[in-house]
């Protein structure tokens, strides 16, 4: 019995068959963040819950210090949603001293760090201008796509302003990846 | 020939191999909803088309009475998009009696119901403040993530206001899940 | 050793087992578009990068002339994000001649073309009214869902106005599909 008998007849099997339940997978959920001062052009990374509630990591996919560690080379689907909330936004007016931070945009970036490569790679970016004339506003940014990742790669989620991230519910802000 | 010979050499296969085309999958599309009285803090569930047009269920994934029934334990990717549409929204003004429904927010929740557990679990939430100063507005909320589900779990999509859901096209509002 | 011995005992394997790394997959990223005259009710297709940077096609999934070609029948997860950017939008005012394009909505459609079928099928649509009172605005529309596709089907991404698409970064605007 040859391995290729399981594959479609028109094509050779180049990779070993493997059980789906054995693939690296993670779904991480939001936790309370340190509400740091918003610095232009510097996007802080979020940290995450990895084992309580809906969160899990399995099959050698590990979470440590804001990073998801990729344990095996392959094609992964990577996704995140960040829900932001804020006060009335800037809408191009002059910012007044002492008033709470009024952003003119919100951004989420899923970033790949490869130790052998000096610069992080931005895999996905969701960016939105915010011009809300009402008082409080809130909205999610969702991202998801497939990437070829290498064993040892690290993934993180960066945001334009950590103090605007809604950390109150695990279903509002999350981050995940799974080997296809 | 041993099953583990198909797995990467560094790891034992713990789950049986199985054909991908045999996995539970569903993509449901929007249908006209029964208008319900908008109740504060109670989000009605949408019902769905499960066999016409782009919609399908397969491999023991069944749809019944607003619920997708999970036929087999495992990790599922679950997703939904709901397109909302409405008239000028509130923007923090006082709501006037008799005026058309002017929401100050729109919300989608994907909810898991487990018969043995009294409270439903909110898996995913997309929530957005609405402050549109023009006349008619419309916008989608998209959600998707991976969850460990158990055989017998039921999934539904709840919305903040069923009367604002755009039911006109199957590509605008949909709900799906597939076993990874 | 019979193939079905790898499947859960309650169910027959109807499809051949196959290595996951052998499945058709593509992730395409944005490139500078040819500006086209904005035609009402006719949404132009985007063209894409298919091999540089984060972009790739593999296992007989090919990209040609704005289309992703489906090489094998099966269930695919298909996704796209388009980031739009523009000047102050219409907000229901009368559009003035000679003023920069001020859209009142932005739309993304993932479309399937089947040669044997005269009309394209809209698989996914994300559409949003735009009423931004500030000056410049930008925002993404994300779409993703699972569809049963046939060998020979072609997928494309259409937008309401190609001149508003942000083509500056590969992580902002993208299109992908993979066989489940």
């Amino acid at each position: 019995l040859k391995g290729q008998e399981f594959a479609p007849s028109h094509q050779q099997v180049y990779a070993p068959l493997r059980a789906d339940g054995d693939k690296p997978r993670a779904h991480l959920t939001v936790v309370r963040q340190t509400p740091t001062q918003h610095l232009k052009n510097q996007f802080p990374a979020l940290h995450w819950e990895h084992e309580l509630g809906l969160a899990f990591t399995k099959n050698r996919m590990n979470y440590t210090n804001k990073f998801l560690l990729i344990p095996e080379s392959g094609d992964y689907f990577v996704y995140s949603q960040v829900t932001f909330r804020g006060m009335t936004s800037e809408c191009s007016e002059i910012r007044q001293a002492g008033r709470p931070n009024k952003p003119d945009s919100i951004t989420v970036v899923i970033t790949k760090v490869t130790d052998s490569y000096p610069e992080p790679t931005q895999l996905l970016m969701g960016t939105k201008s915010v011009c809300e004339v009402g008082s409080n506003w809130f909205q999610p940014i969702y991202l998801g796509a497939m990437f070829s990742l290498q064993e040892g790669d690290k993934l993180m989620v960066n945001v334009s302003d950590i103090s605007l991230v809604d950390y109150t519910k695990e279903d509002k802000t999350f981050f995940g990846a799974f080997l296809l | 020939l041993k099953g583990q010979e198909f797995a990467p050499s560094h790891q034992q296969v713990y789950a049986p191999l199985r054909a991908d085309g045999d996995k539970p999958r569903a993509h449901l599309t929007v249908v006209r909803q029964t208008p319900t009285q908008h109740l504060k803090n109670q989000f009605p569930a949408l019902h769905w088309e499960h066999e016409l047009g782009l919609a399908f269920t397969k491999n023991r994934m069944n749809y019944t009475n607003k619920f997708l029934l999970i036929p087999e334990s495992g990790d599922y990717f679950v997703y939904s998009q709901v397109t909302f549409r409405g008239m000028t929204s509130e923007c923090s003004e006082i709501r006037q009696a008799g005026r058309p429904n002017k929401p100050d927010s729109i919300t989608v929740v994907i909810t898991k119901v487990t018969d043995s557990y009294p409270e439903p679990t909110q898996l995913l939430m997309g929530t957005k403040s609405v402050c549109e100063v023009g006349s008619n507005w419309f916008q989608p909320i998209y959600l998707g993530a991976m969850f460990s589900l158990q055989e017998g779990d039921k999934l539904m999509v709840n919305v903040s206001d069923i009367s604002l859901v755009d039911y006109t096209k199957e590509d605008k509002t949909f709900f799906g899940a597939f076993l990874l | 050793l019979k193939g079905q011995e790898f499947a859960p005992s309650h169910q027959q394997v109807y499809a051949p087992l196959r290595a996951d790394g052998d499945k058709p997959r593509a992730h395409l990223t944005v490139v500078r578009q040819t500006p086209t005259q904005h035609l009402k009710n006719q949404f132009p297709a985007l063209h894409w990068e298919h091999e540089l940077g984060l972009a790739f096609t593999k296992n007989r999934m090919n990209y040609t002339n704005k289309f992703l070609l489906i090489p094998e029948s099966g269930d695919y997860f298909v996704y796209s994000q388009v980031t739009f950017r523009g000047m102050t939008s219409e907000c229901s005012e009368i559009r003035q001649a000679g003023r920069p394009n001020k859209p009142d909505s932005i739309t993304v459609v993932i479309t399937k073309v089947t040669d044997s079928y005269p009309e394209p099928t809209q698989l996914l649509m994300g559409t949003k009214s735009v009423c931004e009172v500030g000056s410049n605005w930008f925002q993404p529309i994300y779409l993703g869902a699972m569809f049963s596709l046939q060998e020979g089907d072609k997928l494309m991404v259409n937008v309401s106005d190609i001149s508003l698409v942000d083509y500056t970064k590969e992580d902002k605007t993208f299109f992908g599909a993979f066989l489940l």
């Epitope: 936790v31 309370r32 963040q33 340190t34 509400p35 740091t36 001062q37 918003h38 940290h47 819950e49 309580l52 509630g53 909330r85 804020g86 006060m87 709470p100 931070n101 302003d161 103090s163 605007l164 950390y167 109150t168 519910k169 | - | -």
Partner: antibody, heavy 120, light 107 residues
Framework: QVQLQQWGAGLLKPSETLSLTCDVY????????WNWIRQPPGKGLEWIGE???????NYNPSLKSRVTISVDTSKNQFSLKLSSVTAADTAVYYC??????????????WGQGTLVTVSS | EIVLTQSPGTLSLSPGERVTLSCRAS???????LAWYQQRAGQAPRLLIY???SRATGIPDRFSGSGSGTDFTLTISRLEPEDFAVYYC????????FGQGTRLEIK
Amino acid sequence: QVQLQQWGAGLLKPSETLSLTCDVYGGSFSGYYWNWIRQPPGKGLEWIGEINHSGITNYNPSLKSRVTISVDTSKNQFSLKLSSVTAADTAVYYCARGYCRSTTCYFDYWGQGTLVTVSS
Amino acid sequence: EIVLTQSPGTLSLSPGERVTLSCRASQSVRSSYLAWYQQRAGQAPRLLIYGASSRATGIPDRFSGSGSGTDFTLTISRLEPEDFAVYYCQQYGSSPTFGQGTRLEIK
């Protein structure tokens, strides 16, 4: 040394609005959560809500409909308003700094407390 | 919301004795979000333990904390006269909650 000093009216009639302010001395205002906590006489502690330097609030669900917390970063102060008070709102009200670094969070500095009595 | 239940409600002990206070959560709590506070009569609470087991600055080493998941304990190895007070556990999730307190009184 960080110090939290709170002030506001101590005696209210039912249906009035409680108003307290907490001044923060000797530390950065950003990077922390600024909280209000109360303790009815002879009872335990109840968290009311919090605000950060961006003005983002998070309230106890049981009090949410009546609570407003605001911030003025230029004065390094934050304030609590609790509307439609009743005798059940009689308590010592504390302001406190919420410290979060990495994934560790706790209340590290507290105000001296203000006894607010609601009586007709 | 996460409910924290402390036991016992009151303890009567003598100086020099060892005491263990219990705090049980209605659902799993991140250890790093679990803190213990001491409140003496007429004073504001004072942080003793954070992250379930780390002593706050200036807290004597007779105080120690342990536990994970839903069960946490505060131990005082040798009671000093100034330790007689009320002790609260607290979780700092998205909606912080306190236990109802354990009163430690002199026998």
